[in-house]
């Protein structure tokens, strides 16, 4: 079983949002298949996505075991129809991925405003806590559980009648802001990990929610 005419994978790229993590690569296979291996710096290689014709592999199950570890993956190329042979000594071509540390590098998914409630001149805005596939003691953890106080939310809020956006911040999932009585306001939130120094510090903005629509309620 040779590895003639197989092309090594290239452009290995981690795509990760809220710890859902997929390794992508090129090229689209012609007469070849791929197997992916992943390991921590000090660990053993574990094979995933055996002999796949896809150019991506979901590695979430592996990286959620310890999101603060640094992982390395590699993609092996085999001829199509390849069957594992115990007698084969020739190592198939492979390419290494960049290192990936989920806690530092996973992108923050778009947040959602769960609700807002007005009481007089105060509005309480609640951000939905997203669930992740990270587990502790067989329980799935939320984004807040994983990041704790490292994660903050920035609230942008503005009168429906004006364009200037005021800001508020919280390291919980709740905001309590002052508003003018009788005015309708709109809200959008952004997740931020201030300790990060890279382009993935911030999420995209949540959808805008405005008072006078179904998510909010008002009490005097």
């Amino acid at each position: 079983s040779g590895t003639t005419n197989t092309v090594a994978a290239y452009n290995l790229t981690w795509k990760s949002t809220n710890f859902k993590t997929i390794l992508e690569w090129e090229p689209k296979p012609i007469n070849q298949v791929y197997t992916v291996q992943i390991s921590t710096k000090s660990g053993d290689w574990k094979s995933k996505c055996f002999y796949t014709a896809d150019t991506e592999c979901d590695l979430t199950d592996e990286i959620v075991k310890d999101v603060k570890q640094t992982y390395l993956a590699r993609v092996f190329s085999y001829p199509a129809g390849h069957v594992e042979s115990t007698g084969s000594t020739e190592e198939p071509p492979y390419e290494n991925s960049p290192e990936f540390t989920p806690y530092l590098e996973t992108n923050l998914g778009q947040p959602t405003i769960q609700s807002f409630e007005q009481v007089g001149t105060k509005v309480n805005v609640t951000v939905q806590d997203e669930w992740t596939l990270v587990r502790r003691n067989d329980t799935f953890l939320s984004l807040r559980d994983v990041f704790g106080k490292d994660l903050i939310y920035t609230l942008y809020y503005w009168k429906s009648s004006s364009s200037g956006k005021k800001t508020a911040k919280t390291n919980t999932n709740e905001f309590l802001i002052d508003v003018d009585k009788g005015e309708n306001y709109c809200f959008s939130v952004q997740a931020v990990i201030p300790s990060r120094r890279t382009a993935n510090r911030k999420s995209t903005d949540s959808p805008v929610e405005c008072m006078g629509h179904e998510k909010g309620e008002s009490r005097e």
Partner: antibody, heavy 120, light 107 residues
């Protein structure tokens, strides 16, 4: 190294316009918030406004609302302050500053400032 | 808008003196107060953030504290390079606002 460099200041007549630039290096402006702050001669700093370059959101001090506009070009990693209908009381050194969007968000880096003089 | 009332507006002190500057917020600003140092012709420099946290690279003779809406900047032993103007700033709500400044001069 994080750096902010303002440019575009100068002498302008009352009612005139000027555009200031704030060129950032060592970080990506779309990951932060950029503020403009001014300081009149012998006075304390006065906040002018901010932009979040990731979404274009802005807010302005009442003293400049309707006359000043903040924008950003993320491809150039630069923020701008367009100043129209300038008045004598707008004379000041104008600084841009970075807001790290932490819980209490101090301005952790400032430019060196550019002087705007409004006089006939 | 939240007013930040800073006092004194100026003070004279000698090298080695303990110097205290205070700032009072017109309403609750939690711990969202920063202190800056400014020298003539230069931009302000961050010293203290979140009321009491020393910014990276700032000498430990600078400290900050909070009591309700009162905030204090203390220089434990004034050094020649500390003669400058100091400003407090709140960033709890938009717009952020600055105190009027305290000029620390040589006695």
């Amino acid at each position: 190294e994080v750096q902010l460099v303002e440019s575009g200041g100068g002498l302008v007549q009352p009612g005139g316009s000027l555009r200031l630039s704030c060129a950032a290096s060592g970080f990506t402006i779309s990951s932060y918030i950029i503020h403009w702050v001014r300081q009149a001669p012998g006075k304390g700093p006065e906040w002018v406004g901010y932009i979040d370059p990731s979404n274009g959101y802005t807010y302005y001090a009442d003293s400049v609302k309707g006359r000043f506009t903040i924008s950003a070009d993320t491809s150039k990693n630069t923020a701008y302050l367009q100043m129209n209908s300038l008045r004598a009381e707008d004379t000041a050194v104008y600084y841009c500053a970075r807001d790290p969007q932490t819980l209490t968000s101090p301005f952790d880096y400032w430019g060196q400032g550019t002087l705007v003089t409004v006089s006939s | 808008d939240i007013q930040m009332t800073q006092s004194p507006s100026s003070l004279s002190a000698s090298v080695g003196d303990r110097v205290t500057i205070t700032c009072r917020a017109s309403q609750d600003v939690n711990t969202a107060v920063a202190w800056y140092q400014q020298k003539p012709g230069k931009a302000p420099k961050l010293l203290i953030y979140s009321a009491s946290f020393l910014y990276s690279g700032v000498p430990s003779r600078f400290s900050g504290s909070r009591s309700g809406t009162d905030f204090t900047l203390t220089i434990s032993s004034l050094q020649p390079e500390d003669f400058a103007t100091y400003y407090c700033q709140q960033h709890y709500t938009t717009p952020p606002t600055f105190g009027q400044g305290t000029k620390v001069e040589i006695k």
